[in-house]
């Protein structure tokens, strides 16, 4: 009998039935999984590898070096520290780590990967997991932050720093417990016949809840936007028929629906791609997953690249800070804000992300 | 049913190449790999290789790496099996087969194909 | 790679026999083994795969057992359309091999 050996790592199959005892496999290399679930692992760099790598590794430094810039300026400037400011200075936290996750998971991709063990791969997997939940976790407090504000008629919530640093607390520990599950025992180490072809450590489950769960965070997302929205509307038109000035209203109006366009277009375009692909790697047998999976996981990522530019680069005094920062230069308001200059400061940062407040008075 | 329908026996001379088809039907082909396996007279089964259609990866026996060239064409649901530069010793039965499992690579195969017999003679 | 070794390499049995063929795997293979049927001028016929689960429409006095690298294929009350050779064929991933095959011969 002629021997058999192969170059290209592969895969085996069902390990549970009615009448086995369950196997574990934490000593096997990840080419026994990988084997098993179809996905091809490299040996060697192709194109396609060195382009999603070379890209990969380009977006982390930018994710890290924007978020890192977003966090100081909202330490130094005394006119962000409001709940607001601290959430948008933690989701800036959150991409950084999603950077530094990525910037990992570059280093251990392709052929690369081989040399992965199981707990390794874990790993890897885990804190992509983490930061990202950490980002969309932070993204819906936001949301619910400003949702907040506007139905109060505020410009800043009058959470205290201690219920933000609790929110804060709560963010992190639900993003890495979320990261964890599949390291602690959500895998399909111990049932092999039901590992996931995109992960193939990850149990079909397990991917099923991860995108069911971000998506259903999306639709909380929308529907509080859109609550947000109606309302502003709503109240504008009111405002409307009884003010001289209906004009500034109405851009205020649209200001806060252009950010919520481009906040939750950058969402969709980023993530539903990824997510729906999870799930059809699950549902559809006959989708070809893996051809499409760098490319929207590398999508994913660019969502931590973009939410400084949205959430920050529109901010017109954050754009100072920035400046102020960059170049060296002494701030020339270090000082908390008084009423009037938060008032008068960041102007369009308030319009958008607080939502129904123009530059000298509320349109709520 | 279920079923792997082969293309018919093939003489080749020493040096030619020889592709065989292997076409599935009552099944999503898509949704299973299907390994080639090959057996000379009064032999034993020696397996060749391996495709799997959602993807389009192909797992080889290194005995015969850069001989056969495993492919499938999901329009039709046909695997195909190319083997080049044949000797007298590629003259076997060649069978295609379906992995018992879907949407993952099990490595046993419940449906068979009835053979193909190539004759490798001078 | 993973050699197989299948014993006896034939024997001769009467219907109403119960049979024991072994198979030996050169390393660990967990429970990943199946065995193959096979009649003159057909192709095999999976019997049992993960070492003892039987493929649907196989008769139960199949059974299978072992794990690791000793495995056995036991045919109780054997009939006369049992004849043929067995294949035995780790599962473990590529590359594949099988072993040598047990002919199973009417006495």
């Known amino acids: 009998m002629a021997a058999i050996s192969t170059s290209i790592p592969v895969i085996s199959q069902p390990q549970f039935t009615a009448m086995n005892e369950p196997q574990c496999f934490y000593n096997e290399s990840i080419a026994f999984f990988y084997n098993r679930s179809g996905k091809h692992l490299a040996t060697e760099w192709n194109t396609v590898s060195k382009l999603v790598m070379g890209l990969g590794i380009t977006v982390c430094i930018f994710i890290m070096l924007a978020n890192l810039l977003v966090m100081v300026a909202i330490y130094v400037n005394r006119r962000f520290h409001f709940p607001i400011y601290y959430l948008m200075a933690n989701l800036a936290a959150a991409d950084f780590f999603a950077g530094l996750a990525y910037f990992y998971l570059m280093f251990n991709t392709g052929p690369n990967t081989r040399r992965l063990t199981v707990s390794t791969w874990l790993l890897r997997q885990g804190l992509i997991d983490t930061s990202l939940t950490a980002s969309v976790a932070n993204l819906l407090a936001i949301a619910i932050e400003r949702h907040i504000t506007v139905f109060r008629m505020q410009l800043h919530t009058r959470m205290s720093n201690r219920r933000v640093v609790v929110v804060i607390v709560v963010i992190w520990t639900m993003a890495i417990v979320m990261g964890a599950i599949p390291s602690v025992g959500w895998n399909c180490i111990c049932d092999i016949e039901n590992c996931s072809n995109m992960a193939p450590l990850y149990s079909d489950s397990y991917l099923v809840f991860w995108a069911i769960f971000n998506l259903v965070t999306f639709v909380v997302m929308v529907v509080l936007y859109a609550h947000i929205f109606g309302y502003v509307r709503q109240r504008t038109m009111r405002m409307s028929r009884h003010s001289s000035g209906p004009r500034r209203n109405r851009d205020t109006m649209m200001s806060l629906l252009k950010t919520v366009v481009i906040v939750l277009g950058a969402f969709i375009i980023c993530w539903t791609p990824g997510l729906v692909l999870l799930l059809l790697d699950v549902c559809c047998p006959q989708c070809d997953v893996l051809a499409y999976e760098k490319f929207f996981l590398l999508l994913a990522e660019f969502n931590s690249a973009m939410n400084p530019i949205i959430y920050s680069y529109r901010d017109k005094e954050m754009s100072a800070t920035f400046r102020q920062i960059l170049c060296c230069q002494r701030s020339e308001n270090p000082t908390g804000p008084t009423e009037g200059s938060d008032r008068s400061a960041s102007s369009l940062n308030h319009t958008i992300l607080a939502g129904v407040h123009s530059n000298d008075h509320s349109v709520v | 049913q279920v079923q792997l329908v082969q293309s018919g026996a093939e003489v080749k001379k020493p040096g030619a190449s020889v592709k065989v088809s292997c076409k599935a039907s009552g099944y999503t082909f898509t949704s299973y790999g299907i390994s080639w396996v090959r057996q000379a007279p009064g032999q034993g089964l020696e397996w060749m290789g391996e495709?799997?259609?959602?993807?389009?990866?192909?797992y080889y026996n290194e005995k015969f790496k850069g001989r056969v060239t495993l492919t499938a064409d999901k329009s039709t649901s046909t695997a195909y099996m190319e083997l080049r530069s044949l000797t007298s010793e590629d003259t076997a039965v060649y069978f295609c087969?379906?992995?018992?499992?879907?949407?993952?690579?099990?490595?046993?195969?419940?449906?068979w194909g009835q053979g193909t017999t190539v004759t490798v003679s001078s | 790679d993973i050699q197989m070794t299948q014993s006896p390499s034939s024997l001769s049995a009467s219907v109403g026999d119960t049979v024991t063929i072994t198979c030996r795997a050169s390393?660990?293979?967990?429970?990943?083994l199946a065995w193959y049927q096979q009649k003159p001028g057909k192709a095999p016929k999976l019997l049992i795969y993960n070492a003892k689960t039987l493929t649907e429409g196989v008769p139960s006095r199949f059974s299978g057992s072992g794990s690791g690298t000793h495995f056995s294929l036991t045919i109780n009350s054997l009939q006369p359309e049992d004849f043929g050779i067995y294949y035995c064929q780790h599962h473990y991933g590529p590359p594949l091999t099988f072993g040598q095959g047990t002919k199973l011969e009417i006495k």
């Open positions: 087969a379906r992995e018992s499992i879907s949407r993952r690579l099990g490595w046993n195969f419940d449906v």
């Open positions: 390393e660990n293979i967990y429970s990943f």
């Open positions: 495709i799997y259609p959602r993807s389009g990866n192909t």
